[in-house]
């Protein structure tokens, strides 16, 4: 799997979208974890709701929020109020029992705001290594901007 490099401004929100095969991953919870070292374990940050029907509901751990659109096959992770300490290697995972399948590896880089409190607008562009592999990001100066998800049936 290629690693997608995503950059975000300190103090703002970074949104990561990992896409997956909705049929293949039907009924599976998704998780966002932080990799400890190059070959180290991936430490769970947050996972979607235990009731798969309710995977579209936002679940949070501190400033990290996850929600899964199981119909579209897109799990969205939002890192709010991005800090320098949030930089690092992460994974989107699909959980089946105790096993975790990696959907996407994401390297998060945190940039200091060069405009110093001025509105950065939509100037930010994600840098990608090799291929985007289904991961996308939205960068917004509005910290409250969230995605709505359709019903899961």
């Amino acid at each position: 799997l290629n690693t997608t490099v995503l950059q975000g401004m300190a103090g703002q929100s970074l949104r990561v979208s990992c896409t997956y095969d909705a049929l293949k991953h039907w009924g599976r919870r998704k998780a966002w974890c932080r990799q400890l070292g190059e070959e180290g374990p991936c430490q769970r940050v947050v996972s979607t709701h235990g009731v798969w029907l309710l995977a579209f509901l936002k679940k949070r751990n501190g400033s990290t929020v996850i929600a899964d659109d199981t119909l579209a096959g897109t799990v969205t992770i939002t890192l709010k109020n991005l800090q320098a300490g949030d930089a690092g290697l992460y994974q989107c995972q699909s959980l089946r029992g105790r096993e975790a399948e990696v959907l996407q590896k994401v390297l998060v880089e945190v940039l200091e705001d060069p405009l110093d409190d001025q509105d950065a607008g939509d100037l930010w562009v994600p840098e990608e290594s090799s291929s985007f592999e289904g991961a996308q990001v939205e960068h917004s100066t509005s910290r409250n901007q969230e995605t709505s998800f359709p019903p899961t049936s």
């Epitope: 579209f56 509901l57 751990n61 019903p151 899961t152």
Partner: antibody, heavy 124, light 106 residues
Framework: QVQLVQSGAEVKKPGASVKVSCKAS????????MHWVRQAPGQGLEWMGI????????SYAQKFQGRVTMTRDTSTSTVYMELSSLRSEDTAVYYC?????????????????WGKGTTVTVSS | EIVMTQSPATLSVSPGERATLSCRAS??????LAWYQQKPGQAPRLLIY???TRATGIPARFSGSGSGTEFTLTISSLQSEDFAVYYC????????FGGGTKVEIK
């Protein structure tokens, strides 16, 4: 106003099945999930499962897996909870409760409207 | 499964006094916690959700606080209609209720 009206009390023998209904009114039935929660005499509340009235998808607590079936009839805005292989410890009041809507990604969720409950007595 | 523990099991309070009920989760549930009131022979009634947001129509004397694993429901000045059983519920991962706290007249 939003209301959940449940079926009447039932007395069943061990091994039998019971089907409890919950008729919703005052809101768009297919826009909110429905939970079932039970309460044994003098005991606390126990979550049993959830149904999506729109598509009919369900998710059950592990304890009730294989014994409970939740269904819905969109034409009458009614959800049903059927519990089979009844035993004396299933004697309880069974509640339906409205869960989260899915028109928006919610920050927090809860069970905001409850039926009055249906008493199910299992006795030989 | 996340286990919810409420304390005390019974709280004896005089009308007009403050009541403080505690709820502890076996692991973090963020702020996905609700409080319900239940009177004998009645269904539970939603009081608080999101740990601290009052449900529609709930009087201001009811307030909730806490996040993670420790939560509190406070009734600032108990009225006669507040004597009941109170349950906390986590909705962060599946759904589990605490064992309840009975608030009785002292």
């Amino acid at each position: 106003q939003v209301q959940l009206v449940q079926s009447g009390a039932e007395v069943k023998k061990p091994g039998a099945s019971v089907k409890v209904s919950c008729k919703a009114s005052g809101y768009t039935f297919t826009s909110y999930y429905m939970h079932w929660v039970r309460q044994a005499p003098g005991q606390g509340l126990e979550w049993m499962g959830i149904i999506n009235p729109s598509g009919g998808s369900t998710s059950y607590a592990q304890k009730f897996q294989g014994r409970v079936t939740m269904t819905r009839d969109t034409s009458t805005s009614t959800v049903y909870m059927e519990l089979s292989s009844l035993r004396s410890e299933d004697t309880a009041v069974y509640y339906c409760a409205r869960g989260p809507g899915y028109t928006t990604a919610l920050d927090y969720y809860y069970m905001d409207v409850w039926g009055k409950g249906t008493t199910v007595t299992v006795s030989s | 499964e996340i286990v919810m523990t409420q304390s005390p099991a019974t709280l004896s309070v005089s009308p007009g006094e403050r009541a403080t009920l505690s709820c502890r989760a076996s692991q973090s549930v963020s702020s996905n916690l609700a409080w319900y009131q239940q009177k004998p022979g009645q269904a539970p009634r939603l009081l608080i959700y999101g740990a601290s947001t009052r449900a529609t129509g709930i009087p201001a004397r009811f307030s909730g606080s806490g996040s993670g694993t420790e939560f509190t429901l406070t009734i600032s000045s108990l009225q006669s209609e507040d004597f009941a059983v109170y349950y906390c519920q986590q909705l962060d991962d599946w759904f589990t209720f605490g064992g309840g706290t009975k608030v009785e007249i002292k």
